[in-house]
Interface confidence: low
């Protein structure tokens, strides 16, 4: 229903705490360079204004749209042009163009320092002094670094953070309580970020229809006992929620997500037998739990897919009468039978089925033409299955760090023009797929591996879009979202690349590396590895392994030496010489 004051309506629905959190996230995602204090001031002003509208919906400006209200606030910031350059030009536009302009200026890779976690004691002190400000800082720091983070989920992670701090700060050994728990939240949040970015990319590049197809496949896998009408309703609602969040309409998004969770819990009987545990949870935990709820048990008596989609004499008639509904039904029926497939694979199969019907229904004898369509799915299914087997075998043999290095070599050869930091980031993320997915039961590996890889490759595409340097990457990123992963997998060594000159300073290290945390040490070594491949793109795995082992030995020796600086300055040049010789 229409409300006299949109801002009052959202404030009432969400409550002050979540209203403020979401407004803070929205501002932090739009203006990523502003400090927490600047944003906190804006949030307070907006909240105070919302309260006046709750008291009197007819008060001045209360009838304005949220985009108008928020946009006016952002555009009133002093020194906008000095700090944000051409983003300030957005303020010359009217809504809805102004909001579109803000969205286009979101930076997926802002030049902000990494979000460093303070040491335990300091963290607990500031948390106890002012939990609200502490959590505000968390929301601000995450949101500005991840401008498409799913806002209601970020509130959930902040709540997790809060619970961990409340528990651990009461313990004697705060550090050992906090570190593993916060690391766990961080890991989950980073995965959530790349997954959501993928959804927004799907929405931005291919529209709502593409996202809805993704949702139908995903929901059908999870809720195989729900009928097609129910799945369509859930997919439509989920599409609306994601469209709002991707579009910066965070209050509407969180409110509608809450409504969807409520609907699901009120209609468990027609959706799934697995929802009760989630529905018993409070607050944000409920929607989070529903978003990753386990698959319901598949109905035992499902007929073969061929009956309705290959053998039925009316296939072409049904397709012609309502293409989207017929294809949607196919996607639903195929997906509910295959929780062991990735959503990307299911969408590729639906695309293949559509292309087959387009071709065959125009021919003289359609059934003879489309009769073999299910058999033609076989190579499409085998390709990702082989990918999973090959990569999980390699992961089990090498471990996470070694597996990351293997991927780094592979991707540097595929796209050596891409900047080394981007290649290292991508390889480290792609390499985590082993730890994340290869330990799962067989039937869960494929969906885990491929959908995770697709999300990471989407980030590679976004970063490459900013400064396109590799024709290989451009080619794979220009195609459809579901074809990206197979495209990247199929890339081979870029023959057009002219190898980089060998620069000794690239491989010169100093004693400061010894005091770095293990993760930072790994990044330094992986940076050197990528540079080696750029110097010798056709180096063999054995050659590279020899060099990297030598390098690891050199670091180990010098970091244990009494006079580290002397060791690095004398042994370093010897290492560089040995590297050149090994790769000659």
């Amino acid at each position: 229903e229409a409300h006299k004051s949109e801002i009052a309506h959202r404030y009432n629905d969400l409550g002050e705490q979540h209203f403020k959190g979401l407004v803070l996230i929205a501002f932090s995602q739009y203006l990523q360079k502003c400090s927490y204090d600047e944003h906190a001031k804006l949030v307070q002003e907006v909240t105070d204004f919302a309260k006046t509208c709750v008291a009197d919906e007819s008060a001045a400006n209360c009838d304005k749209s949220l985009h108008t209200l928020f946009g006016d606030k952002l555009c009133a910031i002093p020194n906008l042009r000095e700090n944000y350059g051409e983003l300030a030009d957005c303020c010359t536009k009217q809504e809805p163009e102004r909001n579109e302009c803000f969205l286009q200026h979101k930076d997926d890779n802002p030049s902000l320092p990494p979000f460093e976690r303070p040491e335990a004691e300091a963290m607990c002190t500031s948390f106890k002094e002012n939990p609200t400000t502490f959590m505000g800082h968390y929301l601000h720091e995450v949101a500005r670094r991840h401008p498409y983070f799913y806002a209601p989920e970020l509130l959930y992670y902040a709540e997790q953070y809060n619970e961990i701090l409340t528990q651990c700060c009461a313990e004697a050994d705060k550090e050992s309580c906090l570190t593993p728990k916060l690391d766990g939240v961080k890991e989950k949040a980073l995965v959530s970020s790349v997954r959501q970015r993928m959804k927004c990319s799907s929405m931005q590049k291919f529209g709502e229809r593409a996202f809805k197809a993704w949702a139908v496949a995903r929901l059908s896998q999870t809720f195989p006992n729900a009928d097609f009408a129910e799945i369509t309703k859930l997919a439509t609602d989920l599409t609306k929620v994601n469209k709002e969040c991707c579009h910066g309409d965070l209050l509407e998004c969180a409110d509608d997500r809450a409504e969807l969770a409520k609907y699901m819990c009120e209609n468990q009987a027609t959706i799934s037998s697995k929802l009760q545990t989630c529905c018993d949870k409070p607050l944000l935990k409920k929607a989070h739990c529903l978003s990753e709820v386990e698959h319901d048990t598949m109905p035992a008596d499902l007929p073969a897919i061929a009956a309705d989609f290959v053998e039925d004499q009316e296939v072409c008639k049904n397709y012609a009468e309502a293409k989207d509904v017929f294809l949607g039904t196919f996607l639903y029926e195929y997906s509910r039978r295959h929780p062991d497939y990735s959503v990307s694979l299911l969408l590729r199969l639906a695309k293949k089925y559509e292309a087959t019907l387009e071709k065959c229904c125009a021919e003289a004898n359609p059934p003879a033409c489309y009769g073999t369509v299910l058999a033609e799915f076989q190579p499409l299914v085998e390709e990702p299955k082989n990918l999973v087997k090959t990569n999980c075998d390699l992961y089990e043999k090498l471990g996470e760090y070694g597996f990351q290095n293997a991927i780094l070599v592979r991707y540097t050869q595929k796209a050596p023009q891409v900047s080394t930091p981007t290649l290292v980031e991508a390889a480290r993320n792609l390499g985590r797929v082993g730890t994340k997915c290869c330990t799962l039961p067989e039937d869960q590996r494929l969906p885990c591996v491929e959908d995770y890889l697709s999300a990471i490759l989407n980030r590679v595409c976004l970063l490459h879009e900013k400064t396109p340097v590799s024709e290989h990457v451009t080619k794979c990123c220009s195609g459809s979202l579901v074809e990206r992963r197979p495209c990247f997998s199929a890339l081979t060594v870029d023959e057009t690349y002219v190898p980089k000159e060998f620069k000794a300073e690239t491989f010169t290290f100093h004693s400061d590396i010894c005091t770095l945390p293990e993760k930072e040490k790994q990044i330094k070594k992986q940076t050197a590895l990528a540079e080696l491949v750029k110097h010798k793109p056709k180096a063999t795995a054995e050659q590279l392994k020899t060099v990297m082992d030598d390098f690891a030995q050199f670091l180990d020796t010098c970091c244990k030496a009494a006079d580290k600086d002397t060791c690095f300055s004398t042994e370093g040049p010897n290492l560089v010489t040995r590297c050149k010789d090994a790769l000659a």
């Epitope: 409550g15 409520k262 607050l283």
Partner: nanobody
Framework: QVQLVESGGGLVQPGGSLRLSCAAS????????LAWYRQAPGKQRDLVAR???????HYADSVKGRFTVSRDNAENTLVLQMNSLKPEDTAVYYC??????????WGQGTQVTVSS
């Protein structure tokens, strides 16, 4: 949805005490924050005190040290213990429940009058 019913209001002399109760029913599992608001004639509704699901409390400056808010999650009740009452505490007191999944709920209100 959450339904709220207040009780315990009445007439009291300045310096006296009153104990307001609020019984919550319905989807009480979804509540994160419970609060008391008050509205004096011709004024807007103001926050008096609130308590989060974790038990942390917040009070309006005007009632700090005099009022205590508590909740019993098992019984789904919210209590406001009001001591050292002043004439300016006269108002209709409303119970409020904030939930992430449902719109906020308000009780019907209970009248508190502080007068000699």
């Amino acid at each position: 949805q959450v339904q709220l019913v207040e009780s315990g209001g009445g007439l009291v002399q300045p310096g006296g005490s009153l104990r307001l109760s609020c019984a919550a029913s319905g989807s009480t599992w979804s509540i994160n924050t419970l609060a008391w608001y008050r509205q004096a004639p011709g004024k807007q509704r103001d926050l008096v005190a609130r308590i989060s699901s974790g038990g942390s409390t917040h009070y309006a400056d005007s009632v700090k040290g005099r009022f205590t808010v508590s909740r019993d999650n098992a019984e789904n009740t919210l209590v406001l213990q009001m001591n050292s009452l002043k004439p300016e505490d006269t108002a209709v007191y409303y119970c409020y429940a904030q939930s992430t999944w449902y719109p906020p709920s308000w009780g019907q209100g209970t009248q508190v009058t502080v007068s000699s």
